[in-house]
Amino acid sequence: MRRGPRSLRGRDAPAPTPCVPAECFDLLVRHCVACGLLRTPRPKPAGASSPAPRTALQPQESVGAGAGEAALPLPGLL
């Protein structure tokens, strides 16, 4: 289940520049890139039981993947 977006203003760094909905924040290069360039999670098959991660890396309230991936179990990355 998706959780509400969190503040992404981390303890160790200022929040990254918000990414537009089709972009994701790449921690290694510290800027927004097309989500398709990152190995974003695929939706799990029905019955998969891993708990949802507590946050994700996109500094944006919408999920940071393309239109076809809006059902990802992660909130958008940082």
């Epitope: 981390g10 921690l27 290069v29 990152l38 190995r39 974003t40 999670p41 991660p53 994700a56 996109q58």
Partner: antibody, heavy 118, light 111 residues
Framework: EVQLQESGPGLVKPSETLSLTCSVS????????WNWIRQPPGKGLEYIGY???????YYNPSLKSRVTISRDTSKNQYSLRLSSVTAADTALYYC????????????WGQGTRVTVSS | DIVMTQSPSSLSASVGDRVTITCRAS??????????MNWFQQKPGKAPKLLIY???NLGSGVPSRFSGSGSGTDFTLTISSLQPEDFATYYC?????????FGQGTKVEIK
């Protein structure tokens, strides 16, 4: 599912160059980060470096002067070259790829053992 | 580089025991509200397997007896009831910044 498979010579002579290739199936190396990690016999894991979706590279400073990571997108493979090897480079070499957004390496090759000896 | 220090370096335990392994980072591995701390299990001659990512999230196919906790610099991997297949070496690893670094490993042996 993403699968990675290392290949290359199991024996390299001192002072020569070690060359390994990682063949990737189930995903494109033009997406994500593609890494090399090694493990000397009986020891822990050491990060070597990555090549990214864009072709940019990062090398661990401890090895930087001797390492080159490159890719062949037409074959969906990436490669490691380590020059001027010594016995200390004897190790099990792994290729691996991390997930996003947590950058945790969830896909690994089975590893290939490289021995440096004359 | 961020230095990862695990303890203990080895431990002996019995099937059914609760096992706790700790990892301390030389600086915080938190960023943007995420703890970039991962745990791996490795058996002899095999590649490491991701057990826990982002400090507390279970990897794919990992049994629920494994759990992770912590934030900042101090983290814990717990096996609630040790099973025969859990005897292995466990590594912590930070993915906050490159070079990604690993702890020295904790070998869990049969008592």
């Amino acid at each position: 599912e993403v699968q990675l498979q290392e290949s290359g010579p199991g024996l390299v002579k001192p002072s020569e160059t070690l060359s390994l290739t990682c063949s990737v199936s189930g995903d494109s190396i033009t997406s994500g980060y593609w890494n090399w990690i090694r493990q000397p016999p009986g020891k822990g894991l050491e990060y070597i470096g990555y090549i990214s979706y864009s072709g940019s590279t990062y090398y661990n400073p401890s090895l930087k002067s001797r390492v080159t990571i490159s890719r062949d997108t037409s074959k969906n493979q990436y490669s490691l070259r380590l020059s001027s090897v010594t016995a200390a480079d004897t190790a099990l070499y792994y290729c691996a790829s991390p997930n996003y957004p947590f950058y945790a390496m969830d896909y690994w090759g089975q590893g290939t053992r490289v021995t440096v000896s004359s | 580089d961020i230095v990862m220090t695990q303890s203990p370096s080895s431990l002996s335990a019995s099937v059914g025991d609760r096992v706790t392994i700790t990892c301390r980072a030389s600086e915080s591995v938190d960023n943007y509200g995420i703890s970039f701390m991962n745990w791996f299990q490795q058996k002899p001659g095999k590649a490491p397997k991701l057990l826990i990512y982002a400090a507390s999230n279970l990897g794919s196919g990992v049994p629920s007896r494994f759990s992770g906790s912590g934030s900042g610099t101090d983290f814990t991997l717990t096996i609630s009831s040790l099973q025969p297949e859990d005897f292995a070496t466990y590594y912590c690893q930070q993915s906050k910044e490159v070079p990604w670094t690993f702890g020295q490993g904790t070998k869990v042996e049969i008592k």
